[in-house]
């Protein structure tokens, strides 16, 4: 029959060429002479001339060696025609399958593969995957089936078998415990890929395994004991720098130190921070230390890392003995701010108060006193006793120097230390009011019409405090009551001035006497401008001109 079974041809054939493969034969050749031809890729189209056919015998010929990795299968058509060129058969499909030879070695996809794994992991932990390819067939043969293996490991510490590789997938995993970055930070594995499922050609590559840091080393104080000297009262003073060593990766959270004062700082006098570059612990004073109260502090400082430990590790502790150094301390007024009530206007030379300071130092130092700031110059201070006396008139109503009844004075105490030190205190004199001001009307100038005049309401003010103020009383003097009346309102804080008789247009003085609740009297002259007008007026109209 005009059919042909698929033809298998091994690649890389030795020849000789042309090589007969199979014979095309039409049973129509009994009736007529048949001529054979082939068409298709590999025959009359690219790649041309790989196959040919003997025109008269029908032998299919291979003209050169085949390469399966280039073309694994050829599909040709066979034709049979009579002498006159007429087709005697339908075109026949010819399949030529190129069978594989193991003519390619495996190739790793990279010369060097890089992976990483955390130190201290257990066997079974995946590290990385390597890949090799082989162009040969891996479906019908083992020619392209790659098996992976580890040829060598460097260094061979702590064992020569730290890693293994899955023979089929190329996944490298940990086979032994003992990965320790601090001892071996990197392993170099020579890996092999062998075709024929491990029995064929071999190629090698390198797998570099970086061992990643875990916080498996505690920071350790070096040294563990420190002595420091600190002047008393110094705040923010650097006491000591504590040094630690940590075998973990520098500048990582597993290396960066965290310091904690574990004991000895009952008064919360100290603080400790980590230096960002050196990793040292910087111990400083949070509050001033007091030599007289405690001249030595023994601190216990523990160090850990920013990152938690991955396993139970003993923590390192340092002992710091802090010696407090005595300094000449300034005298301190007791209290720092003293409030004294004193009546305003007391006589000159009258004692106001005694204001003294104490010296924190143990020695009996002599303290002398003086006034540092006395804005009005009202006071004097005895340099030995701290006695404050009045040398001027204390005036509660003096708005330049007194605020809210308080006159503020700053005093100074100086010891006789070497060098001497000074301390200041604030004396707050609360001035008690005396009835030293009479009531005053506002305004003191009025304009009023001499016909149907409007009553003039004047406000009454008194610089003193209650009870030396309202209710006020009003009285007209010096015959002012002939033309005018003055009445204090019910509340007693305003006076109403009224014109009771006609006065011609002019300016007049109204003599008004006001007294407060303590009968302090004040005479005030009110300038009254009377105008020729009716009712309400603010300024007198000009003279009327008729037309």
């Amino acid at each position: 029959d005009w059919v042909v079974a698929p033809i298998s041809v091994p690649e890389n054939g030795k020849g000789p060429f042309p090589q007969r493969l199979n014979q095309l034969k039409s049973n129509k050749d009994r009736d007529t002479k048949i001529f054979y031809s082939i068409t298709g890729p590999g025959a009359d189209s690219p790649p041309e001339g790989v196959f040919a056919v003997e025109k008269e015998t029908g032998w299919l010929l291979l003209n050169k060696p085949l390469d399966r990795e280039e073309i694994a299968k050829y599909e040709l058509f066979g034709h049979a025609v009579s002498e006159n060129g007429a087709s005697v058969e339908d075109p026949m499909n010819i399949s030529i399958i190129v069978t594989d030879q193991n003519d390619h070695k495996p190739k790793f996809t990279q010369d060097t593969f890089r992976g990483s794994v955390l130190e201290g992991v257990l066997p079974g932990t995946s590290v990385m995957q390597v890949t090799a390819t082989d162009e040969d067939d891996a479906i019908y043969t083992y020619n392209g089936v790659v098996a992976y293996s580890i040829h060598s490991q460097e260094p061979k510490d702590p064992h020569d078998l730290m890693f293994t590789i899955h023979r089929s997938t190329g996944t490298i995993s940990v086979i032994s415990s003992g990965l320790d970055r601090e001892k071996v930070p990197e392993y170099t594995l020579t890996i092999q890929a062998t075709d024929m499922d491990g029995d064929g050609s071999t190629t090698t590559a390198v797998a570099v395994v970086e061992i990643l840091d875990a916080n498996d080393n505690a920071p350790m104080f070096d040294p563990q004991k420190y002595e420091a000297h600190v002047p008393e009262n110094a705040v923010g003073h650097e006491v000591q720098r504590l040094t630690v060593t940590d075998l973990d990766a520098p500048n990582s959270p597993a290396w960066r130190a965290t310091y904690l004062i574990m004991g000895g700082d009952d008064g919360d006098h100290f603080t400790i921070t980590t230096h960002p570059e050196s990793n040292q612990g910087i111990l400083t004073t949070r509050k001033g230390l007091d030599f007289e109260a405690k001249n030595q502090h023994t601190l216990y400082v523990e160090v850990t890392n920013e990152a938690p430990f991955v396993l139970k590790l003993p923590t390192s502790t340092a002992t710091i003995v802090v010696h407090v150094e005595d300094v000449n301390e300034a005298p301190v007024f007791v209290p720092p701010s003293k409030v004294v009530e004193v009546q305003e206007g007391i006589p000159t030379g009258e004692p106001v108060c005694v204001y003294t300071a104490e010296d924190p130092d143990k020695e009996n130092q002599k303290i002398s006193y003086r006034i540092l700031r006395d804005p009005a110059g009202w006071l004097a201070m005895d340099p030995d006793s701290g006695q404050v006396t009045a040398v001027g008139t204390l005036d509660r109503e003096d708005e330049q120097f007194v605020r809210n009844n308080i006159y503020e004075v700053m005093v100074l105490a100086m010891d006789n230390g070497s060098p001497p030190t000074t301390g200041t205190g604030t004396l707050l004199l609360t001035l008690i009011d005396v009835n030293d001001h009479g009531p005053v009307p506002e305004p003191r100038q009025i304009t009023i019409c001499n016909q149907s005049p409007v009553r003039q309401v004047l406000n009454i003010t008194d610089k003193d405090l209650s009870p030396h103020t309202s209710p006020f009383q009003a009285q007209l003097t010096d015959d002012s009551d002939i033309y005018w009346t003055a009445e204090v309102n019910e509340e007693g804080d305003t006076v109403v001035l009224s014109l009771k008789k006609f006065l011609k247009q002019d300016t007049y003085d109204v003599h008004l006497s006001l007294s407060d609740h303590g009968n302090k009297e004040q005479l005030t002259v009110i300038r009254a401008t009377v105008c020729d007008c009716h009712g309400h007026v603010e300024t007198c109209p000009g003279p009327w001109k008729g037309g």
Epitope: G120, L122, P123, T171, I175, S176
Partner: antibody
Framework: EVQLLESGGGLVQPGGSLRLSCAAS????????MSWVRQAPGKGLEWVSA????????YYADSVKGRFTISRDNSKNTLYLQMNSLRAEDTAVYYC??????????WGQGTMVTVSS | QSALTQPASVSGSPGQSITISCTGT?????????VSWYQQHPGKAPKLILS???KRPSGVSNRFSGSKSGNTASLSISGLQAEDEADYYC???????????FGGGTKLTVL
């Protein structure tokens, strides 16, 4: 001579706790992962838990996860297994074993744990 | 049910040879050359007799040998002796948190 010696086994009621110890000698203890393997009466060997040489990494069989805790003290060359919420099916001989590459070697002599009311 | 499959029992007469198989998958026995065999006498702890498929620790008789083909490993004992009667277990490395798989064990009887 390389030696592993387990202790701490005994009779305990269901829901109770027990702590097993394994004292190691004759090798650099901190360089090796260690495992606990158990064998129920008349049954095969069953891996229970493992811990890395440093103690920073641990594995557990699903059957004991959340109930058992493996730990080690390298300064004392001792491996521990803290067993909580014990069940009848935890009854077994418990062995400690050193993990050499791809093997368990050597093994301790075992300690019997009986969980029964 | 164990991860690796072993025959429950095998037997042989003194002087004979026997083989115990241990079948896994392409991700354990088939993937790695880390198959080990252990011998356990009644009431005793297991003892390593072969590691890495066919490596004998010192002190183990050369009558014990191992091999591997595909996903199956085998333990062979030649010249059977009475003291060989014991349970035999295989283990294989595998990647993951259960990094060592156990076989169910094989009871060897020396007739």
């Amino acid at each position: 001579e390389v030696q592993l010696l387990e202790s701490g086994g005994g009779l305990v009621q269901p829901g109770g706790s027990l702590r097993l110890s394994c004292a190691a000698s004759g090798f650099t203890f901190s360089s090796y992962a260690m495992s606990w393997v158990r064998q129920a009466p008349g049954k095969g060997l069953e891996w229970v838990s493992a811990i890395s040489g440093s103690g920073g990494s641990t594995y557990y069989a699903d059957s004991v996860k959340g109930r058992f805790t493996i730990s080690r003290d390298n300064s004392k060359n001792t491996l521990y297994l803290q067993m909580n919420s014990l069940r009848a099916e935890d009854t077994a001989v418990y062995y400690c074993a050193t993990n050499s590459p791809g093997t368990f070697d050597p093994w301790g002599q075992g300690t019997m744990v009986t969980v029964s009311s | 049910q164990s991860a690796l499959t072993q025959p429950a029992s095998v037997s042989g007469s003194p002087g004979q040879s026997i083989t115990i198989s241990c079948t896994g998958t392409s991700n354990d026995v088939g993937a790695y050359n880390y198959v080990s065999w252990y011998q356990q006498h009644p009431g005793k702890a297991p003892k390593l007799i072969l590691s890495e498929v066919n490596k004998r620790p010192s002190g183990v008789s050369n009558r014990f040998s191992g091999s591997k083909s595909g996903n199956t490993a085998s333990l062979s004992i030649s010249g059977l002796q009475a003291e060989d009667e014991a349970d035999y277990y295989c283990t294989s490395y595998t990647m993951g948190s259960t990094f060592m798989l156990f076989g169910g064990g094989t009871k060897l009887t020396v007739l």
